[in-house]
């Protein structure tokens, strides 16, 4: 999906009002020195591409993020504010339902959510673009 035509300000508002707080709740109890962010993004569409990938694509050691509250709210925000996004996700959602697993918070998931927080920071304030 090409995130170029999303309403970035509306997505930012959704993130700051609720999603960010859900991410903080998920990370509560984790030391702030524990993880080193290695995933980066250069502009808002790129940030959303990386955010979508980390939030919804199962990875080795962390298969369950898509069912977390912050993920469901992220999906809703993208569906509302990115034209045509929901249509592209129908097949992916059906595939995910087939491999539904019980929620487990692993260290790998915590690391992935730490990466997500970093990506959202850059989405909210791209450093090199004059916005």
């Amino acid at each position: 999906y090409d995130f170029t035509n999303c309403d970035f300000e509306k997505i930012k508002a959704a993130y700051l009002s609720t999603i960010s707080k859900d991410l903080i709740t998920y990370m509560s109890g984790t030391k702030s020195t524990e993880f080193n962010n290695t995933v980066s993004c250069s502009n808002r569409p790129h940030c959303l591409t990386e955010i979508q990938s980390l939030t919804f694509n199962p990875t080795a050691g962390c298969a369950s993020l898509a069912k977390e509250m912050f993920a469901m709210k992220t999906k809703a925000a993208l569906a509302i504010w990115c034209p045509g996004y929901s249509e592209t996700q129908i097949n992916a959602t059906q595939a995910m339902k087939k491999r539904r697993k019980r929620k487990v918070t692993t260290n790998k998931c915590l690391e992935q959510v730490s990466q997500l927080q970093g990506l959202w920071r850059r989405f909210n304030r791209p450093l090199l673009k004059q916005q």
């Epitope: 300000e9 993880f35 850059r122 304030r125 090199l128």
Partner: antibody, heavy 119, light 107 residues
């Protein structure tokens, strides 16, 4: 606990340079932007620029381009600002600050470093 | 550059009364406004981000509102420890810019 500790006060001659350090602790240094802000005596706050310690990317206020250089040393979790061609108007308290968890504000600030430029 | 203009420059309010500080941007900054408090001899402290979101540990008597070009910081019931200079800041476009500050005193 997140802390930003800055180097001590400096007195400099016009035309010279100054380098101020900002040592971060209590969080992963490379994960958060470091901002630099200054405050002239009795005046308001002026943004100088920002650096991403993770990759060295910077963005400067045009008013300081060419005179201010922001750097970061990941091995010591320390950010630096160097200001060259100093003039009396550069007399100010220089602050480093960290971006907050959302990227939309500065949540932790250093204690400030007073730089006095005088002949 | 976006100019942030605060009003008034200084304000004297009785203890327990409401204090209101305004901030006007020279062009729309969406909701990208932050408020800081600075007490004499101290570094600034974050109060409110993204117009109205409270930073951790900031008392509920502080609130922010507005959008576009006009923003307000309100202290619902002034306490002695609220004496400080208050700054608005926009982070909508580079360079980031601050208001000139509003000095809040007790009447």
């Amino acid at each position: 606990e997140v802390q930003l500790v800055q180097s001590g006060a400096e007195v400099k001659k016009p035309g010279s340079s100054v380098k101020v350090s900002c040592k971060a602790s209590g969080y992963t240094f490379s994960n958060y932007l470091i901002e630099w802000v200054r405050q002239a005596p009795g005046q308001g706050l002026e943004w100088i620029g920002v650096i991403d310690p993770g990759n060295g990317d910077t963005n400067y206020n045009e008013n300081f381009k060419g005179r201010a250089t922001l750097t970061a040393d990941k091995s010591t979790s320390t950010a630096y600002i160097e200001l060259s061609s100093l003039r009396s108007e550069d007399t100010a308290v220089y602050y480093c600050a960290r971006e907050d968890n959302t990227g939309t504000a500065f949540d932790y600030w250093g204690q400030g470093t007073t730089v006095t430029v005088s002949s | 550059d976006i100019v942030m203009t605060q009003s008034p420059d200084s304000l004297a309010v009785s203890l327990g009364e409401r204090a209101t500080i305004n901030c006007k941007a020279s062009q729309s900054v969406s909701s990208d406004v932050t408020w800081y408090q600075q007490k004499p001899g101290q570094s600034p402290k974050l109060l409110i981000y993204y117009v109205s979101e409270h930073y951790t540990g900031v008392p509920d008597r502080f609130s922010g509102s507005g959008s576009g070009t006009d923003f307000t910081l309100t202290i619902s019931s002034l306490q002695a420890e609220d004496v400080a200079v208050y700054y608005c800041q926009q982070h909508h476009r580079f360079p980031l810019t601050f208001g000139q500050g509003t000095k809040l005193e007790i009447k």
